[in-house]
Interface confidence: low
């Protein structure tokens, strides 16, 4: 309606004597700014005067000043939209209606606000959810329709008079819509909180009590149970009787059904609060509890562990592990159902009692073949001794033992023989399935564990065999000790270290690399002629005639071996020089004559020199001296000299006679 002033504020405000009131307020005038404001207490309209009568709590002045008696009431608004008020302190007789008389230039308005001031602080109000269940988080709310900036308060939660340790969240509202203080507490109630008193306490800033509200918690929960057993330790012997009683300590709402469970499974036809077990058997040992249900759900008691004691049952043996490998560790476990647990054990190996073994487990740190066999045990507790069960078999596996390589041939073995060896062993578990031989060769295995070496080599020194099951055991190698003729026979010159010159002292050595047997004989030969029987052949003064092809032989009882032929070369200066003439030593003038210097030398002559009868050297240095045409004055004695790397040699004189031709004689 456009003819009205528009106000917004809480309809009623609440406070108590000595507190304060804060009135949030907004307005919109019909025209222009506010020119006059009066706050009435319980205003009454006077028709005669056309004015409002009543106590004036506040009045605005032309200069905006507030008289000192008006300090208790404050107008905190402005001239166009805010009409907030504060009364501090507020008194009991302030209760009633507050009238806000507003005047603008042309319009007037009276706005009414209710104020409810009580003599004492009024209590807050606790709000609970419609249903509370154990262990489910709920929010408890404490609401107070009061808040004022000038009067701080606090709300505290108590459980059975004791402050609650959960943190509460307090919020305040001072708005045109609502004025309140609220505290919210998140809380997970347990069944034990059922029926307990929760208090929300209003306190001033100093923690002084002002007022409170209380509620009794109604916590829905499953039945809470206690189980009692006779005998109290729940330990009995077979044939005894046992009574269990289920007591409900709390249930909200009331319980509806009862049942009993053993090891989590419901016992049929047991729906009362007492469970009677008569003449119990060992099968009735287990964990018992009672279960009682209500609308929330089932509740279970703690478990009672009923132990029905009995003597050990026939025992069985568990072996970790069989088959066992020799040298490994093995553990035997005696398993026998008994209550109480067995305190003593007796162990048997192949029916014979094992001394000093009284524990549930027998540990053998290093298994040997003799540990194999049947193991059984007997368990004993306070109620008696059990029977010996069937036992368990321990199989001890091990590599083949005492493996040997045996030579089947008569000794000695000669190079080229056929050798047969066998691989023998003492015992094995599991059985030997194959054999191996070292070194590897292209050898024949005619049957399992037998090796045949055809045409045995001189260098076949040792052979080893292995007998194999799951593992291989190697025998010590055996020496074949193959006998053979001397090997790698050769001639070696010991001296001189350099080339051999005529007249040198010369030694030749007959070498060989190996021989089995070691006892040998030596033979030297040249051109099929035996020269000596020592390992060395010596020449005190070598001559060119000693040159030639030499061989040495070495023999033992197996055979004889010759070296390659070795050539002995003797170096010497030219010797046996002579001058030969062609066609002869008498030649007719005008013909040709050829003189040849013949010699024996090693190395061959490298340089020739010719001399005449006057010992004059001629300017010719080849082996042949050719005179053509020959002249009478060429007649005379000639000789030659030959030179090699060793030395020189000269020939005796040879005479050339040149005679006149018939023509020359005819002219004379």
């Amino acid at each position: 309606d456009s003819s009205k002033w528009v106000f917004e504020h809480p309809e009623t405000l609440y406070a108590w004597e000595g507190a304060c009131v804060w009135i949030p307020c907004t307005y919109r005038a019909l025209d222009g700014d506010l020119e006059s404001f009066i706050l009435f207490h319980n205003p009454e309209y006077n028709k005669n005067t056309s004015k409002f009568d009543g106590t004036r709590l506040y009045e605005s002045t032309k200069d905006g000043k507030v008289p000192s008696e008006q300090k208790r009431v404050q107008f905190l608004g402005d001239k166009n939209k805010n009409c907030t008020l504060s009364i501090h302190p507020v008194h009991l007789n302030d209760s009633g209606q507050l009238g806000l008389r507003m005047e603008s230039k042309t319009e007037k308005w009276m706005e009414r606000i209710h104020l409810n001031v009580s003599e004492r602080p009024f209590p807050p109000h606790i709000q609970l959810p419609p249903e509370i269940q154990e262990s489910q988080e709920v929010t408890l709310t404490c609401l107070l329709n009061f808040s004022c900036y000038g009067y701080p308060i606090q709300l505290q939660w108590l459980l059975e008079g004791v402050p609650m340790r959960q943190a509460a969240v307090t919020s305040t509202s001072l708005t045109i819509k609502s004025v309140f203080t609220r505290s919210e507490l998140k809380f997970s109630p347990q069944w034990s909180h059922h029926g307990k008193i929760v208090t929300c306490q209003l306190q001033d800033a100093d923690g002084k009590f002002l007022s409170n509200d209380t509620v009794q918690l109604n916590v829905k929960h499953t039945p809470k149970l206690e189980i009692k057993v006779t005998p109290s330790d729940a330990i009995v012997r077979e044939g005894d009787s046992v009574t269990m009683t289920c007591e409900v300590s709390s249930s909200n709402p009331e319980y509806t059904t009862v049942s009993w469970l053993k090891d989590g499974t419901s016992l049929k036809k047991q729906n009362t609060f007492t469970l009677n077990l008569r003449e119990v058997t060992k099968d009735q040992s287990g964990k018992y509890c009672c279960q009682v249900s209500n609308d929330v759900g089932p509740g279970r008691s703690e478990e009672v562990f009923l132990q029905v004691q009995y003597a050990p049952e026939p025992s069985t043996v568990q072996i970790l592990h069989s088959p066992a490998v020799e040298g490994s560790q093995v553990e035997f476990l005696c398993m026998s159902l008994a209550n109480p647990l067995p305190t003593n054990y007796t162990w048997y190996h192949n029916g014979k009692e094992m001394q000093g073994r009284t524990e549930e487990k027998v540990h053998i740190p290093k298994i040997l073949p003799w540990h194999a066999g049947t193991y059984s045990c007997v368990a004993e507790n306070i109620l008696g001794t059990g029977q010996r069960g069937p036992g368990a078999e321990l199989d001890v596996q091990y590599p083949p033992k005492k493996v040997t390589t045996v030579i089947q041939n008569p000794m000695p073995i000669r190079e080229g023989d056929t050798v047969t060896l066998s691989c023998n062993y003492n015992s094995s578990n599991p059985s030997v399935t194959r054999y191996e031989w070292k070194p590897h060769g292209a050898w024949e295995e005619p049957s399992l564990g037998v090796l045949k070496i055809q045409n045995v080599g001189w260098d076949n020194t040792t052979i080893a065999c292995a007998a194999c099951n799951s593992w291989c055991s190697w025998a010590s190698p055996v020496a074949l000790n193959v006998q053979y003729a001397p090997r790698d026979v050769r001639v070696r010159k010991i001296k001189p270290l350099s080339e051999i010159h005529s007249g040198n002292s010369v030694s030749l050595q007959c070498d060989f690399s190996s021989s089995h047997p070691k006892e040998v004989q030596f033979f030297w030969e040249k051109n099929g002629r035996l020269l000596g029987k020592e390992s060395q052949l010596n020449f005190d003064s070598i001559s060119p005639e000693d040159a030639g092809s030499y061989s040495c032989w070495v023999n033992n009882s197996i055979g004889q071996t010759a070296s390659k032929a070795w050539t002995l070369e003797v170096l010497y200066a030219p010797r046996r020089l002579r001058v030969s003439m062609s066609p002869g030593d008498q030649v007719m003038e005008g013909k040709s004559a050829t003189l040849t210097c013949e010699s024996d030398a090693n190395p061959p002559v490298s340089h020739y020199t010719w001399f005449d009868w006057n010992n004059q050297s001629l300017p010719y240095h080849s082996q042949k001296l050719r005179l053509e045409p020959v002249k009478v004055q060429h007649s005379g004695a000639y000789w030659c000299q030959g030179t090699n790397s060793v030395g020189k040699g000269r020939s005796p004189l040879s005479t050339l006679t040149v005679y006149y031709s018939p023509e020359t004689i005819g002219r004379r």
């Epitope: 490998v325 590599p399 292995a466 194999c468 799951s470 593992w471 291989c472």
Partner: nanobody, 118 residues
């Protein structure tokens, strides 16, 4: 004839890890054992660990708890996972092969160098 090829060696700081591999080829015996030996300069060859094709494993006291030996029989490959390495683990590591579970190691690899720096 069995050929063995090692790999995975190298330089690592003390406390670090390495994984050695050894690939075998030419093997014919179904039950065999592969092992690791090592040789530090100036020392004799020292046994490290062994693993047979049927699952048996064994370790030298000096490496037990730090080294783990394993085998992939399908790939004919052996591995040595070396953790918490120490300077004294520095050596040439050799892979070996032999028949049976308690093998006589007939074949040896060329070796791979492992150096642990402090």
């Amino acid at each position: 004839q069995v050929q063995l090829v090692e790999s995975g060696g190298g330089l690592v700081q003390a406390g670090g890890s390495l994984r050695l591999s050894c690939a075998a080829s030419g093997s014919t015996f179904s039950l065999n054992t592969m092992a690791w030996y090592r040789q530090a300069p100036g020392n004799q060859r020292e046994y490290v660990a062994a693993a047979s094709s049927d699952g048996y494993t064994n370790y030298a006291d000096s490496v037990r708890g730090r080294f783990t030996i394993s085998r992939d029989n399908d790939k004919n490959t052996m591995y040595l996972q070396m953790n918490s390495l120490r300077p004294e683990d520095t050596a040439v590591y050799y892979c070996t092969w032999g028949t049976g579970r308690f093998a006589d190691y007939i074949y040896w690899g060329q070796g791979t160098q492992v150096t642990v720096s402090s």
